[in-house]
């Protein structure tokens, strides 16, 4: 079976890393486990990993935004940032605003690697399933 | 044969969903049909679907922009929005502006699904083949 | 072996096309050669090609930004722009700013094709490995 995941935004996320909807809607989860916000790799190999986050706010104050996909493995002491997007000075002060960040690339992942998504400002994330998501597939 | 498509912007299009160049240039279409703006799936399975739209204008008024990839199937009464990007308050009033929206993710598609791209304002789309495109491939 | 590459930003790039880190960090290079900024295809076929560039500056002057993935082959006299992103009027004058451009799509590539990334303003690119990268894999 193809190892694949597509998880969508979960609006009751209250902490980092982001948590994801892994059951309902346009979700996919096959040959990969989901655990506390993370996708857990169970077979070493090459994977295309992607994420999109939709940020929006009622009144722009240009708070710096970041969106990271990072990896954690018990063998390593520190998280490894695989992909990252940052935004600064992106909207007109006081206006309602909206913007997305998209990341996607190929990585060599090892069994037991845990992949997560982090954002700098949770209150500015909109969790609609079509707008904010996290996925991967084994090549 | 690998099921794959890469369609590029078609500039004399006035209709929604967007219409695409399916013959000339850097276009690919193999094992998937193109019909009236849509990519028609003929084999159930996992697909990576992507689209990029290039918006630009002579004088910024921050018209809200949206870019959607959606799916239609005669078995379902309503379109399903698979991926979406929105932009608000993204340029300086009165200035010439340009911005792209990129979407890409994995979906489980069924034979006879039709995939389309929609934008909120067609007049602001630039259809250069390198800038605006729509594609997929079967994993 | 799977033909795959993921190259990351190299901060001593001084000219176009961009040069890339092909040895250290989260780099992948298998079944594809790297030569003077370019990924060299050695087997004809379908490839998913992607790139992300992270632009940032101390004081916004809205210099137009472009990010291109292009192809060169000795059989053709001219470069072919495969994908391109442009940004104009994207930040507030005088402010510190940051923005990313992401490109990714499927192409039919031929043995001896050379793929490169070009940007309009090298001094505004940040080369962190998680932020600026270039990759592909054979479907």
């Amino acid at each position: 079976l193809r190892k694949v995941a597509h998880l969508t935004g979960k609006s009751n996320s209250r902490s980092m890393p982001l948590e994801w909807e892994d059951t309902y809607g346009i979700v996919l989860l096959s040959g990969v486990k989901y655990k506390k916000g993370g996708l857990v790799i169970n077979e070493t190999g090459l994977y295309f990993v992607y994420s999109k986050v939709y940020f929006r706010g009622q009144s722009c104050n240009n708070l710096p935004l970041s969106h990271k996909v990072y990896m954690r493995n018990s063998k390593y002491p520190q998280d490894l940032v695989m992909m990252e997007g940052k935004m600064m000075s992106y909207c007109t002060t006081g206006q309602m605003w909206a913007r997305s960040s998209y990341l996607g690339a190929v990585f060599n992942l090892t069994s037991a690697d845990h992949l997560y998504v982090n954002v700098s400002e949770l209150s500015l994330v909109n969790f609609e399933e079509s707008q904010t998501f996290f996925g991967l597939y084994k090549l | 044969l690998r099921k794959v498509a890469h369609l590029t912007g078609k500039s004399n299009s006035r209709s929604m969903p967007l219409e695409w160049e399916d013959t000339y240039g850097i276009v690919l279409l193999s094992g998937v049909k193109y019909k009236k703006g849509g990519l028609v799936i003929n084999e159930t399975g996992l697909y990576f679907v992507y689209s990029k739209v290039y918006f630009r204008g002579q004088s910024c008024n921050n018209l809200p922009l949206s870019h959607k990839v959606y799916m239609r199937n005669s078995k379902y009464p309503q379109d399903l929005v698979m991926m979406e990007g929105k932009m608000m308050s993204y340029c300086t009033t009165g200035q010439m502006w340009a911005r792209s929206s990129y979407l890409g993710a994995v979906f489980n598609l069924t034979s006879a699904d039709h995939l389309y791209v929609n934008v909120s304002e067609l007049s602001l789309v630039n259809f250069e083949e390198s800038q605006t495109f729509f594609g997929l491939y079967k994993l | 072996l799977r033909k795959v590459a993921h190259l990351t930003g190299k901060s001593n790039s001084r000219s176009m096309p961009l040069e890339w880190e092909d040895t250290y960090g989260i780099v992948l290079l298998s079944g594809v050669k790297y030569k003077k900024g370019g990924l060299v295809i050695n087997e004809t076929g379908l490839y998913f090609v992607y790139s992300k560039v992270y632009f940032r500056g101390q004081s916004c002057n809205n210099l137009p930004l472009s990010h291109k993935v292009y192809m060169r082959n000795s059989k053709y006299p001219q470069d072919l722009v495969m994908m391109e992103g442009k940004m104009m009027s994207y930040c507030t004058t005088g402010q510190m700013w940051a923005r990313s451009s992401y490109l990714g799509a499927v192409f039919n590539l031929t043995s001896a094709d050379h793929l490169y990334v070009n940007v309009s303003e090298l001094s505004l690119v940040n080369f962190e490995e998680s932020q600026t990268f270039f990759g592909l894999y054979k479907l």
């Epitope: - | 006035r14 018209l63 909120s120 304002e121 007049s123 | -």
Partner: antibody, heavy 119, light 111 residues
């Protein structure tokens, strides 16, 4: 900057036709609709139809179907509105307006052309 | 066709005061994304000028004292503090379907 410049005032006999021109500049003519709106003396605004210069497609208000014809000349970035079988109630100022395709708001207007229908 | 009804027909306001103009559509002009209603200002002998688009978005170059709100069938144009140059006729227009139709207009005059 975007400009729409219309042809001058016309006086026409009942039963005849009138053709008003609208020359566009300052933007890509083939990417936006041109709509035509008329305003009878002391009255409100009435939308007549739109044309898309990109492919020449058009749509008309049923109230004018069969009497109005919208055309464009891409080489000169000019739109035309021809109204036939004129009657006295067609006396009005006729405006062309640039219209965004999807949002269909009229963001730039011509100065207007007064058409008087009188015997 | 969608009928647009504006009220009042005439609004008498003193300079510096707030003006509130209403526009009602005979059926909803909103989708999940946008409300397809636009507001224009017209002065005697001039073409209309776009003020507000998609119910609440200020057109570039229009002063911030103009604002729009509403969804579905009920919409409002507000001028927070009337200036002398704001005395004019105001029209709402929908673009939800064909034909595009305008309201009959509200004349804002000096009290």
């Amino acid at each position: 900057q975007v400009q729409l410049v219309q042809s001058g005032a016309e006086v026409k006999k009942p039963g005849s036709s009138v053709k008003v021109s609208c020359k566009a500049s300052g933007y890509t003519f083939t990417r936006f609709d041109i709509s035509w709106v008329r305003q009878a003396p002391g009255q409100g605004l009435e939308w007549m139809g739109w044309i898309f210069p990109g492919d020449g497609s058009s749509q008309y208000n049923e109230n004018f179907k069969g009497r109005v014809t919208l055309t464009t000349d891409k080489s000169t970035s000019t739109a035309y509105m021809e109204l036939s079988s004129l009657r006295s109630e067609d006396t009005a100022v006729y405006f062309c307006a640039r219209s965004l395709i999807s949002t269909a708001m009229f963001d730039h207007w011509g100065q207007g052309t007064l058409v008087t229908v009188s015997s | 066709e969608i009928v647009m009804t504006q009220s009042p027909a005439t609004l008498s306001v003193s300079p510096g005061e707030r003006a509130t103009l209403s526009c009602r559509a005979s059926k909803s002009v909103s989708t999940s994304d946008f409300s397809y209603i636009h507001w224009y200002q017209q002065k005697p002998g001039q073409a209309p000028r776009l003020l507000i688009y998609l119910a609440s978005h200020l057109e570039s170059g229009i002063p911030a004292r103009f604002s729009g709100s509403g969804s579905g069938t009920e919409f409002t144009l507000t001028i927070s503090s009337l200036q002398s140059e704001d005395f004019a006729v105001y029209y709402c227009q929908h673009s939800r379907e064909l034909p595009r139709t305008f309201g009959q207009g509200t004349k804002v005059e000096i009290k």
